[in-house]
């Protein structure tokens, strides 16, 4: 399977909420011995590979923001910790996977990565990720609402296998 990022750039005003989205593409095995671990983190555009480094989002690590579920299930974070930081990650039946960030500040600007790990038989892992940029703006040049910019077809499928 692959991960697509429908939007490569989100430009938002301070104080707004935003939902960053990734989507699983291709065949997703829904067998009883297959589960999915999904999470989000901040990163930098590395020289070798984007999304290599895992930095916290609002002081929460990728471990704090994870979802873990079977191939046919939906899930969302009910962690008080995440919600106290204005964050919630969610996953639906259709392969959509998102993180919502509330009350954006300039400090939220940066590169965000979604990570999906398909786990088979509890030990075999296939890892994919997607990347997108969030720009939070203030002042007269800031948009009144979030503006999203679609990924080019080439950019929208970031594939990294483990």
């Amino acid at each position: 399977f692959k991960v697509a990022t429908p939007y490569s750039l989100y430009v938002c005003p301070e104080g707004q909420n935003v939902t960053l989205t990734c989507r699983l593409l291709g065949p997703v095995d829904k067998g009883h011995d297959v589960t999915f671990y999904k999470t989000w983190y901040r990163s930098s555009r590395g020289e070798v590979q984007t999304c290599s480094e895992r930095r916290p989002i609002r002081n929460l690590t990728f471990q704090d923001l994870h979802l873990h579920h079977g191939g046919h299930q939906a899930a969302n974070t009910s962690h008080d910790l995440a919600q106290r930081h204005g964050l919630e990650s969610a996953s639906d039946h259709h392969g959509n996977f998102s993180i919502t960030m509330r009350n954006l500040t300039l400090l939220d600007s940066g590169l965000y990565c979604c990570l999906v790990v398909e786990i088979r038989h509890h030990h075999s892992e296939h890892r994919v990720h997607g990347a997108m940029e969030l720009q939070v703006q203030t002042g007269k040049d800031a948009p009144s609402n979030c503006v999203v910019y679609p990924s080019s077809s080439q950019d929208s499928e970031n594939i990294t296998a483990a």
Epitope: T35, Y37, S52, F62, Q63, H68, V117, A162
Partner: antibody, heavy 118, light 106 residues
Framework: QVQLVQSGAEVKKPGASVKISCKAS????????MNWVRQAPGQGLEWIGL????????SYAQKFQGRATLTVDKSTSTAYMELSSLRSEDTAVYYC???????????WGQGTLVTVSS | EIVLTQSPATMSASPGERVTMSCSAS?????MYWYQQKPGQAPRLLIY???NLASGVPARFSGSGSGTDYTLTISSMEPEDFAVYYC?????????FGQGTKLEIK
């Protein structure tokens, strides 16, 4: 803060079994796999196996298949490793360690020394 | 099973010296992980996904490599860096460690 606290040292006779516990706190127990690694005196690290508290799924290194049994008690966030048919070569420090999927073992227990001697 | 071979098995260095150690895999792996272990202590994660520093690890440590050849470098040795270093792979089951490189004070 994240903690993995293991049970105390054990002395066993050859042929016996030992069961070690690893109590987790400070994190979501079901979001990680619990791995077991051992280290014989003066030797390197050897991976025994893992268990997913999320669904109880296990994987073992071939060497320990059939002799090691990994279990969890989600109600107490505790992982267990039982090793049967002990022999002198099983004398080692046994560690539990948590691992997030697609990551590494970032927190380890303090280790449990198991001595097998007649 | 993927066999990880670390070299050298033992090496000596002085504080302030640059140190490099290697980990060679018997077949290609996607990522390498490095741990540090001091006597009487549990291992500590140093490097994840080949080249990224784990939380709290000083910037003098760095990792690199791909395929079958990986390297851990300490740019300027500090007294607390004398320890045993292990590489490990999660790419293929069963998950294996190298035999370790012992870093001693010269």
């Amino acid at each position: 803060q994240v903690q993995l606290v293991q049970s105390g040292a054990e002395v066993k006779k050859p042929g016996a079994s030992v069961k070690i516990s690893c109590k987790a706190s400070g994190f979501s127990f079901t979001g990680y796999t619990m791995n077991w690694v051992r280290q014989a005196p003066g030797q390197g690290l050897e991976w025994i196996g893992l268990i997913s508290p999320y669904n109880g799924g296990t994987s073992y290194a071939q060497k320990f298949q059939g002799r090691a049994t990994l279990t969890v008690d989600k109600s107490t966030s505790t992982a267990y490793m039982e090793l049967s048919s002990l022999r002198s070569e099983d004398t080692a420090v046994y560690y539990c360690a948590r691992r997030a999927y697609g990551y590494a073992m970032d927190y380890w227990g303090q280790g449990t020394l198991v001595t097998v001697s007649s | 099973e993927i066999v990880l071979t670390q070299s050298p098995a033992t090496m000596s260095a002085s504080p302030g010296e640059r140190v490099t150690m290697s980990c060679s895999a018997s077949s290609s792996v996607s990522y390498m992980y490095w741990y540090q272990q001091k006597p009487g202590q549990a291992p500590r994660l140093l490097i994840y996904d080949t080249s990224n520093l784990a939380s709290g690890v000083p910037a003098r440590f760095s990792g690199s490599g791909s395929g079958t050849d990986y390297t851990l470098t300490i740019s300027s040795m500090e007294p607390e860096d004398f320890a045993v270093y292990y590489c490990q792979q999660w790419s293929s089951y069963p998950f294996t460690f190298g035999q370790g490189t012992k870093l001693e004070i010269k």
